[in-house]
Interface confidence: low
Amino acid sequence: EDLKKVFPPKVAVFEPSEAEISHTQKATLVCLATGFYPDHVELSWWVNGKEVHSGVSTDPQPLKEQPALEDSRYSLSSRLRVSATFWHNPRNHFRCQVQFYGLSEDDEWTEDRDKPITQKISAEAWGRADC
Amino acid sequence: PYIQNPDPAVYQLRGSKSNDTSVCLFTDFDSVMNVSQSKDSDVHITDKTVLDMRSMDFKSNGAVAWSNKSDFACTSAFKDSVIPADTFFPSPESSC
């Protein structure tokens, strides 16, 4: 790969909609990994420190953000759906982890975010207690 | 897969305060429904994928649309797909 063209993903977790929770008694978290090149990524969901597969659906392949460009950056999305009760338990911790290849290991992004969402190379959310 | 009780809906999801990306989730729609790519290059729409909540014996179709455009709205995110008019559920303002 041309290392000059390596761009790491930005990773963000989006909280479930309260409308979905009240309408379906289920909660869908969405993880977005955006702006990366090349398209070698692996996305996984971790709940309370354990990798989960049930309730997860990830795009089969990354999406070109600008389809007309030969060397367009890529995006990938994934959904994790849990019961409303599970989401509302504030002890539950949800983490979307994206592995990206081609970066030297001393690159880092340390911007802090308010909980319940933290955006890093991985992103996480905490279950929300009822207000 | 066969979706037992399709209940198509579009929900707006909230990211962190400093995140300028808006995300819309189109979910629980029938398998015959197709999701079209956006004609707007600043709006990204995924293909539909199937999610299986094995512990609840529940499967659902879903697709995600997102954009950094300030005027991007979930009401029009999937406008190029043929979806029922009453599928958009506005999110109540959080009182937390």
């Epitope: 971790w46 420190g49 190379i121 | -």
Partner: nanobody
Framework: EVQLVESGGGVVQPGGSLRLSCVAS????????YGWYRQAPGKEREKVAH???????DYADSAKGRFTISRDESKNTVYLQMNSLRPEDTALYYC???????????WGQGTLVTVSS
Amino acid sequence: EVQLVESGGGVVQPGGSLRLSCVASWEVHKINFYGWYRQAPGKEREKVAHISIGDQTDYADSAKGRFTISRDESKNTVYLQMNSLRPEDTALYYCRALSRIWPYDYWGQGTLVTVSS
């Protein structure tokens, strides 16, 4: 960058005990998850135990009832207490941490445990 240093390995007789320690060179609040893994000669690396935020723990079947993972945030240290050791527990034991900043997946160099009479 996080550095993980394991210690506590050694030679022990079957039925004996060892306590492995893993010290992180970084504030523990930046680490979401710790794990102990092991690799026996000629075999693949396998999970032994995990501990995550809220001290939620998870054990491999082979470790249940015999091994205990714990951590001491004040010392930035995670422990693996191993009791009733068996010859098949002989392996190189590695500590792993998942942190909140890149590169988020860290491994120690390993500490050797030999169970032999």
